[in-house]
């Protein structure tokens, strides 16, 4: 089969780092300078990706494989492949159209990307609040009041959280 | 202009080796692909080895264990070592560096 299928399209012959050249009756040819094929009975080569700008490069192109680009500190990779670079934010922030804001009270984001969450609402599991949350943080659940025997313990469900100097934007 | 002149072919028997030598005027290393083709009679020029733009050596599977291409830029001369030579590696070969291609060098592997 294979020999058949040669036969047929001997461009199925073009291993990776080649492409089948039509203008040189259907040989194989190297890839040109900064172009590559991954795959073999390619009819063209692919540019190679530029990392630019804010993307870096994590691995140069060769004849065979794409550069990969991740990004510059400071911003980190979406998409797939890392096709877009979002500024970072600080923990305890999400990033909106107007730039990096805090978390509103009650929600908290523990990394430098993403959306703020909400905090953990012990209660639907029946629990207490052991540790407030805070703008970074979630909250950390105890055992319900109900398993804490008179005596058992000297914990006291908290006040509730208020973030000090975090006035309306 | 740029030329590319292979030597080096010859009458071998099986098992024996040659080394071929493709020597090029003109500063087209930089800029280039080298590779060596051959083309048996009635068949078609079919790629060999080749040393690719990132300065990596690619073999076909035919050439794979028995064939080493190698490059001296401050010659301007790209080499095929070939070892454990078959009858079926009898062909003219012919070097190349993106268009311009040489005369070629005939081998004949024969017992």
């Known amino acids: 089969f294979e020999r058949t299928r040669s036969l047929q399209d001997p461009c199925s012959n073009c291993p990776a780092g080649t492409f089948c050249d039509n203008n040189r009756n259907q040989i194989c040819s190297p890839c040109p300078p900064n172009s590559f094929s991954s795959a073999g009975g390619q009819r063209t080569c692919d540019i190679c990706r530029q990392c630019k700008g804010v993307f870096r490069t994590r691995k140069e192109c060769s004849s065979t494989s794409n550069a990969e680009c991740d990004c510059t500190p400071g911003f980190h990779c979406l998409g797939a492949g890392c096709s877009m670079c979002e500024q970072d934010c600080k923990q305890g922030q999400e990033l909106t159209k107007k730039g990096c804001k805090d978390c509103c009270f009650g929600t908290f984001n523990d990394q430098k990307r993403g959306i703020c969450r909400p905090w953990t609402n012990c209660s639907l599991d029946g629990k207490s609040v052991l540790v407030n949350g805070t703008k970074e943080r979630d909250v950390v659940c105890g055992p319900s009041p109900a398993d804490l025997s008179p005596g058992a313990s000297s914990v006291t469900p908290p006040a509730p959280a208020r973030e000090p100097g975090h006035s309306p934007q | 202009a740029v030329q590319l002149v292979e030597s080096g072919g010859g009458l071998v028997q099986p098992g024996g080796s040659l080394r071929l030598s493709c020597a090029a005027s003109g500063n087209i290393f930089s800029i280039h692909v080298s590779a060596w083709y051959r083309q048996a009679p009635g068949k078609q020029r079919e790629l060999v080895a080749w040393?690719?733009?990132?300065?990596?050596?690619h073999y076909a599977d035919s050439a794979k264990g028995r064939f080493t291409i190698s490059r001296d830029n401050t010659k301007k001369t790209t080499y095929l070592q070939m070892n454990s030579l078959k009858l079926e590696d009898t062909a003219a070969y012919y070097c190349?560096?993106?268009?311009?291609w040489g005369q070629g060098t005939q081998v004949t592997v024969s017992s």
């Open positions: 040393i690719a733009w990132d300065n990596v050596a």
């Open positions: 190349n560096s993106g268009d311009f």
